[in-house]
């Protein structure tokens, strides 16, 4: 904690300004008042101080906004940004997409991604949805930003927005996230030719379930094995092996290099071997001939 | 084949909590999204939301604030909570299915339960 | 939300005959709408869906016809079974919305 003193009448501070970069850190604490700070947030940023300096400028703030910034100043926090934490940010409320761009460009190239999950899960709870201006800012200068929302926030994307959103947008989402916007990336795209349709849905597949799955085995699509790898195992492993040598048509081959990785793996343990020797790519592991396979999730089910 | 089947309480009391429970059999919950479709005595549809067997939700936006859908995968269930019901709340509640395959690509349900008469008053 | 409007509310067309539904959307749908028919204190049942294609074990009477905005239900030749109540629904965008029925009834 910075130690309270009084400020010298030499020192007292009527602009926020360069001169203020030969102030010891307790003289800025004694002499820089935070209303003025407040006011003039936007000439911090222009002026070089060192680590130390910025915080004791935000321990001002912190004491003059005990509550959380206001967005004036947060919009002109400039690489004071740098010094928040993720329970900082959890106290504003930014509406504004220049607030957001201007953080997410002082953010860049410091590992600060929790804080930027919370300075956009703010955003998403401001604007009150994820909407297409907000997706196509994240898009623009946080690729990858939009999977580190939690699958509560993302379900506030209208699936009109979904078409903003590119493959590597998608590349952190998990399967929580993936089960939100699949859905509302196959209502978008609903109205799109087979192959072009498939072009777009793709990125999404991560989400989807069996059913989906096999319908798109018959629609001679040719999925990638990267794209294969990233499907839900439990959407994978009810597929037969005639799916999925229709699903992955030529790719089919890659499933030997796949063989110990799930779900190929996993997909495996539960064909029958006669099946998979038809691929004729040495595939081993599965069930052996003359063996029963007894179905006990729909037994249970059942009972 | 699959079947759907509704329960819980016909008659639940106006401010409290109306709990619903579709339990699927003869087939998994997996493999497809779940709908609660509610019509009031002598009117027509109307869908409250959906869920995928991992959790993923989505609600009609005139009843989101008082809609609870959560799964149990392992009972291969799936049920409805709605809060601060009504008279207006009066419905046979339906359990569906979404069909919704690429093939066909669309939001449609293929699958009903018999539905259940759920009646709001003190 | 798409409202979706059915005509005529009432409908008496005698067995044998033709009768025609009609559903129009609020906002364009496409073809994203489907058909159900549903009988005294029983659910609905699936008819069409892609405004056209009929559901597995539907019979070839019933028809549907439209795109955007205007939807039809056609049934080509009333059978005792088919007086129930038809809806329409969109699933063109959430929330899923139906149209508010038409009674199908002997004339």
């Known amino acids: 904690d910075v130690e309270r003193t009084t400020c010298p009448p030499e020192k007292e501070v009527h602009e926020i300004d360069e001169s203020l970069i030969f102030y010891k850190k307790r003289e800025l604490e004694a002499c820089v008042d935070a209303a003025l700070l407040a006011a003039q947030m936007d000439r911090v940023d222009a002026i070089p101080f060192t680590y130390e300096q910025l915080d004791v400028l935000k321990h001002k703030l912190d004491e003059l906004y005990p509550q959380g910034y206001p967005e004036s100043v947060i919009r002109h926090l400039g690489h004071l940004f740098l010094k928040m934490s993720p329970e900082d940010i959890r106290k504003w409320n930014v509406t504004s997409l220049e607030t957001l761009k201007a953080l997410l460009k002082v953010s860049k190239g410091h590992e600060m991604s929790a804080q930027v999950a919370t300075l956009i899960d703010r955003v998403v709870v401001g604007r009150g949805q994820l909407d297409k201006d907000t997706v196509d800012t994240l898009t623009a200068f946080c690729p990858g930003c939009l999977c580190s929302l939690s699958p509560e926030r993302l379900s506030s994307v209208p699936p009109s927005v979904i078409g903003a959103v590119r493959p590597q947008d998608l590349d952190t989402c998990g399967p929580r996230q993936l089960d939100v916007l699949y859905p509302k990336a196959r209502l978008a795209f609903q109205n799109m030719s087979g192959s072009e349709y498939f072009v777009k849905i793709r990125p999404f597949l991560g989400g989807a379930p069996t059913e989906d799955v096999k319908a798109l085995s018959q629609q001679n699509v040719s999925m990638d094995l990267a794209t294969f790898m990233k499907l839900r195992r439990e959407a994978v492993l009810p597929l037969t092996v005639a799916e999925v040598q229709k699903l992955l048509g030529p790719h089919v081959e890659g499933l030997k290099v796949e063989e110990q990785h799930s779900p190929v793996r996993d997909w495996i343990l539960k064909q029958r071997q006669d099946d998979l020797d038809t691929l004729g790519l040495g595939l081993q592991g599965g069930i052996p001939n003359g063996y029963l396979i007894l179905d006990l999730s729909v037994r249970e089910a059942l009972s | 084949q699959v079947q759907l089947q509704e329960s819980g309480p016909g008659l639940v009391k106006p401010s409290e909590t109306l709990s619903l429970t579709c339990t699927v059999s003869?087939?998994?919950?997996?493999?497809?999204?779940w709908s609660w479709v509610r019509q009031p005595p002598g009117k027509g549809l109307e869908w409250i939301g959906y869920?995928?067997?991992?959790?993923?939700?989505q609600s009609n936006p005139s009843l989101k604030s008082r809609v609870i859908i959560s799964v149990d995968t392992s009972k291969n269930q799936f049920s409805l909570k709605l809060s601060s019901v009504t008279a207006a709340d009066t419905a046979v509640y339906y359990c569906?299915?979404?069909?919704?395959?690429?093939?066909?690509?669309?939001?449609?349900?293929?699958?009903w339960g018999r539905g259940t008469l759920v009646t709001v008053s003190s | 939300e798409i409202v979706m409007t059915q005509s005529p509310a009432t409908l008496s067309v005698s067995p044998g005959e033709r009768a025609t539904l009609s559903c129009r959307a609020s906002?364009?749908?496409?073809?994203?709408l489907a058909w159900y028919q549903q009988k005294p204190g029983q659910a609905p049942r699936l008819l069409i869906y892609?405004?056209?294609t009929r559901a597995t074990g539907i019979p070839a009477r019933f028809s549907g016809s439209g795109s955007g905005t205007e939807f039809t239900l056609t049934i080509s030749s009333l059978q005792s079974e088919d007086f129930a109540v038809y809806y329409c629904?969109?699933?063109?965008?959430?929330?899923?919305?139906f149209g508010q029925g038409t009674r199908l009834e002997i004339k």
């Open positions: 569906a299915r979404e069909v919704g395959r690429i093939a066909v690509a669309g939001w449609f349900f293929d699958l």
């Open positions: 003869g087939g998994s919950i997996q493999n497809y999204y």
């Open positions: 869920i995928f067997y991992s959790g993923s939700t």
């Open positions: 906002q364009s749908v496409n073809a994203n």
């Open positions: 892609g405004a056209s």
């Open positions: 629904q969109q699933y063109n965008n959430w929330p899923l919305t």
